[in-house]
């Protein structure tokens, strides 16, 4: 049975139970490009953060360039959420618990500011993909995932013809794409700059707040 | 959903100055490149200006040396200072944003630039 993020009594400055993530966040100074707003406080290592900037990384053998080559004004957005994912000890209200042979937790719903997704599907318009959800259904043979049968590689707009259905279907409902905009403290940010600090503690506050979790 | 929300605009003697404005709402306005453009009655769409979200320029021939792009990415703003205007510079102008490598689809209502001589 699945475990709500009730059940969790940690919902503040957590890390997910999952493949890479450290058990504790903590200071990480070395942490890569992208992943460098977090170096304050991390789920991920210096590492960790150096291999998911790489084409096909060893993180998960996932390749983005399934479908040729991807711009790298889209790519840059799958990196940013992977730094999310891997580095944010600010998820926790979100945190569910998985049956799965790679990690035992999972993030769900998590409130994307809008701003974020819309930016996301707008730089992948031009670029391709197969699936709709990346979650499941590729061909793994020969280690790195492949097109299925019978998937044929389109325009993103094609597999999702709107924001929402990127940012919420891509990740199995990873996100769900928040009415709120960024700055309000209401909505968690993938992209920010880390000189103001890291504006997702604040909302990771309210929600926890709003769940009746110390 | 994106908007832009272009003003400023109005009528100025020949040699005069004008600064247009652009407001962007809806993407994450830092990341992109940002332009101005201009459409005189019975001619095409054309770029003026352009600047990287790095803030790199780029000016068509007939402007260089007159107008000033620039941005406040705090205010998600983009600016056009127009100088020793000129009656051929009489357009409705527009801005748009730039995502990866296209301008985008998304429109203002723009904003009536008249130049009288």
């Known amino acids: 049975t699945m475990c709500s993020a009730q059940d969790r009594t940690d919902l503040l400055n957590v890390c997910m139970d999952a493949k890479h993530h450290k058990t504790k966040p903590g200071p990480e100074d070395k942490l890569h490009d992208q992943c460098s707003p977090w170096k304050k406080n991390a789920c991920c290592t210096a590492s960790t953060s150096q291999e998911l900037h790489k084409d096909t990384s060893r993180l998960y053998n996932f390749n983005w360039d399934h479908c040729g080559k991807m711009e790298p004004a889209c790519k840059r957005h799958f990196i940013q959420d992977t730094c999310l994912y891997e580095c944010s000890p600010n998820l926790g209200p979100w945190i569910q618990q998985v049956n799965q042979s790679w990690r035992k937790e999972r993030f769900l719903d998590v409130p994307l500011c809008k701003e974020d997704c819309q930016q996301w599907w707008e730089d992948c318009h031009t670029s391709h993909t197969c699936k709709s959800n990346w979650h499941r259904g590729w061909d793994w043979t020969s280690g790195v995932n492949k097109c299925p049968a019978g998937a044929l590689c389109r325009t993103f707009e094609s597999y999702f013809p709107t924001p929402a259905a990127l940012c919420e279907g891509l990740w199995s409902h990873s996100y769900k794409v928040s009415n709120y905009s960024r700055g309000s403290g209401r909505c968690i940010q993938m992209w920010f700059d880390s000189a103001q600090g890291n504006p997702n503690e604040e909302v990771a506050r309210f929600y926890a707040a709003a769940m009746h979790v110390n | 959903q994106v908007q832009l929300q272009e003003s400023g605009g109005g009528l100025v003697q020949a040699g005069g100055s004008l600064r247009v404005s652009c407001a962007a709402s809806?993407?994450?306005?830092?990341?992109?490149?940002m332009g101005w453009f201009r459409q005189a009655p019975g001619k095409q769409r054309e770029l003026v200006a352009s600047?990287?979200?790095?803030?790199?320029?780029k000016y068509a021939d007939s402007v260089k040396g007159r107008f000033t792009i620039s941005r406040d990415n705090a205010k998600n703003t983009v600016y056009l200072q127009m100088n020793s205007l000129k009656p051929e510079d009489t357009a409705v102008y527009y801005c748009?944003?730039?995502?990866?490598?296209?301008?985008?689809?998304?429109w203002g209502q723009g904003t009536q630039v008249t130049v009288s001589s």
């Open positions: 600047i990287t979200s790095g803030g790199s320029t």
């Open positions: 809806g993407i994450i306005f830092s990341m992109n490149g």
């Open positions: 748009n944003i730039q995502f990866g490598s296209r301008w985008s689809t998304y």
